[in-house]
């Protein structure tokens, strides 16, 4: 999947299986990513588990779990708030669109989470105070998570190089992270579809093009669009909302 | 299987984890790689049958050869960060104010700095 980190790095990661997205004193978010096509290096999020840890007089431990075709509007125990404690309403789930869009407000840690199902896969977005981001007490797991550190070098896909190959008239098959590139989706069509939803040619737009060329699945256009929309709502610095690719001085550095 | 902790410590030691080292950083990068290798070796008993372990081992081998790191040499120390107090060590309160981050934050300082993370698509 594409990852925008807390430090505004933008990466395309092939991380497969279960990976920690956030892991701090208050919150643990784990994603499971699966290949979008058989044999493909490109992966998308098929499962998401969020654990809100027990916190003072505010909330009991609550677990939220979403999977493909199952986006619940409640925690795993069926509740919609933080439990029986005095400040239980400082954690709340709101269903925005049934089966498609859920928002979780954790006021006790100043955090808002948006989970969506777009097509077959899930998207995740969070707004969190820096103090909470860095509240990692256990040194063993310090910096464990993708949202903070990004994904490791050997797990990144350089989609700028991929794009350069895609733009050339006869692209070699090796340019694709997937051995099964749908030939029915020419570069120009992908560009046009992404331009419709994402008029600014930023990294969300580039991600959209990459996804369409890799999978041929137009739902990924919406995934990029909603990721940007969620960014608009959740990013505190509106000037930093659109990310643009940097000049590629370093191998593996995307954005 | 704690292989993800090894991964995390390596990313932490190599800063943002998002770029290759500059030439003058290579000794430190190699030291971090050797630490990573040691960490993965320690997880072998509990992770050896799992993909994440083998990915890490192969990734280390690739990076070692890419950056001409020797197998022997110094290792790096994990970075130590000063941390805000954990939730349970804060003063308990029956007042719901403690359950409203912004309200309790404003008492001590200016508005908090917010950050954003997102994951989508493929």
């Amino acid at each position: 999947p594409h990852l925008r980190t807390f430090t505004d790095h933008f990466q395309t990661c092939k991380v497969q299986g279960a990976w920690p997205l956030i892991d701090n004193n208050y919150l643990n978010v784990q994603v499971t990513n699966t290949p979008v096509l058989p044999g493909s290096a490109a992966t998308a999020t098929s499962k998401l588990t969020i654990i809100f840890k027990n916190f003072q007089e505010c909330v009991d431990q609550k677990v939220y779990q979403a999977e493909m075709d199952e986006l619940p509007s409640a925690f795993a125990d069926g509740s919609k708030n933080g439990g029986d404690k005095h400040g239980a309403n400082s954690l709340k789930i709101t269903e925005k669109v049934s089966g498609q869009h859920v928002e979780i407000q954790a006021k006790y840690i100043g955090t808002t989470i948006v989970v969506r199902q777009v097509g077959r896969y899930l998207t995740f977005a969070v707004r969190m105070p820096e103090e909470v981001v860095n509240a990692v007490e256990d040194r063993d797991s310090q910096g464990l998570y993708l949202c903070l550190r990004g994904c490791p070098l050997n797990q990144q896909i350089d989609f700028q190089a991929f794009r350069a190959n895609a733009e050339s008239p006869r692209r070699p098959a090796a340019a694709s992270p997937s051995p099964v590139v749908p030939e029915t989706f020419p570069y120009e069509t992908a560009v046009a579809k992404c331009k419709e939803k994402l008029p600014v040619e930023d990294l969300y737009y580039q991600a959209c093009v990459f996804d369409l060329l890799t999978t041929g699945d137009v739902n990924f256009t919406l995934a990029a669009y909603y990721a940007l929309e969620d960014g608009k709502m959740l990013h505190s610095n509106k000037d930093k909302l659109h990310l643009f690719e940097r000049t590629r001085e370093l191998p593996g550095a995307v954005a | 299987c704690k292989i993800l902790k090894c991964n995390s410590e390596f990313w932490s030691a190599t800063s943002s984890g998002s770029h290759a080292p500059a030439s003058d950083d290579v000794p430190e990068f190699c030291a971090a790689l050797r630490t990573y290798a040691l960490c993965t070796r320690r997880t072998a008993r509990t992770c050896r049958g799992d993909l994440a372990y083998h990915s890490a081992v192969h990734g280390i081998e690739d990076l070692m050869s890419q950056h001409n790191c020797s197998k022997d040499g110094p290792t790096s120390q994990p970075r130590v960060r000063t941390l805000p107090p954990a939730g349970d060590s804060q003063e308990r309160s029956d007042s719901p104010e403690i359950c409203h981050y912004e309200k309790s934050f404003h008492k001590h300082s200016a508005a908090p700095n917010y950050t954003h993370c997102g994951l989508f698509g493929d």
């Epitope: 499971t32 | 299987c1 040691l38 008993r45 509990t46 050896r48 049958g49 799992d50």
Partner: antibody
Framework: EVQLVESGGGLVQPGGSLRLSCAAS????????MNWIRQAPGKGLEWIGM????????HYADSVKGRFTISRDNSKNTLYLQMNSLRAEDTAVYYC????????WGQGTMVTVSS | DVVLTQSPLSLPVTLGQPASISCRSS???????????LEWFQQRPGQSPRLLIY???NRFSGVPDRFSGSGSGTDFTLKISRVEAEDVGVYYC?????????FGQGTKLEIK
């Protein structure tokens, strides 16, 4: 939610063969080593063997070496245990378990070896 | 093979009281790197085993904090601070340090 469902157990005569299956769901099966463990009636747990995520290595307990074979089909999210030359002492509930070190277990399937 | 010996084999406990199970290994379970790979499993009547503790003292996800593990070298202990009715069952220690991996013979916890 991690789910492991064993099947294929039953009554078999000494010297006979049986193949057990373990259907996995709720996690990325192809990422994990898998184990078989058994429990004779009223007795403790005995590890039988394990297989790596990609089938590249298999390890067995001495008591079953040469008679039992573990395999897997990652495209079907299924783990197998082929049991040959069965003996009365192989009578047990057979469990499959996820991970190089088992964290989640199935509910088990009963194998009875008797004439 | 490494032999794990548990004691007692049967442990009657009053509800709300603490319980302690010992596991002794025939050789040290500490690796040359200083890690110790000893786990504890719980098997309730009629159910499959469930992981409680890994690497001597780490609680597995969802395990109540009344369970704790301790020990080093060859001597290990599983403690339950206040026994509840749902804790009835057999408890096994399990070592992963040496091949082949081995289980203890089990300790049956029952309510007095």
């Amino acid at each position: 939610e991690v789910q492991l469902v064993e099947s294929g157990g039953g009554l078999v005569q000494p010297g006979g063969s049986l193949r057990l299956s373990c259907a996995a769901s709720g996690f990325t099966f192809s990422n994990y080593g898998m184990n078989w463990i058994r429990q004779a009636p009223g007795k403790g747990l005995e590890w039988i063997g394990m297989i790596y995520y990609d089938s590249s290595e298999k390890h067995y307990a001495d008591s079953v070496k040469g008679r039992f074979t573990i395999s897997r089909d990652n495209s079907k999210n299924t783990l197998y245990l082929q049991m040959n030359s069965l003996r009365a002492e192989d009578t047990a509930v057979y469990y499959c378990a996820k991970g190089t070190t088992p964290d989640y277990w199935g509910q088990g399937t009963m194998v009875t070896v008797s004439s | 093979d490494v032999v794990l010996t548990q004691s007692p084999l049967s442990l009657p406990v009053t509800l709300g009281q603490p319980a302690s199970i010992s596991c002794r290994s025939s050789q040290s379970l500490e690796t040359s790197d200083g890690d110790t790979f000893l786990e504890w499993f719980q098997q309730r009547p009629g159910q499959s085993p469930r992981l409680l503790i890994y690497e001597v003292s780490n609680r597995f996800s969802g395990v109540p904090d009344r369970f704790s593990g301790s020990g080093s070298g060859t001597d290990f202990t599983l403690k339950i601070s206040r026994v509840e009715a749902e804790d009835v069952g057999v408890y096994y220690c399990f070592q992963v340090t040496h091949d082949p991996v081995t289980f203890g013979q089990g300790t049956k916890l029952e309510i007095k």
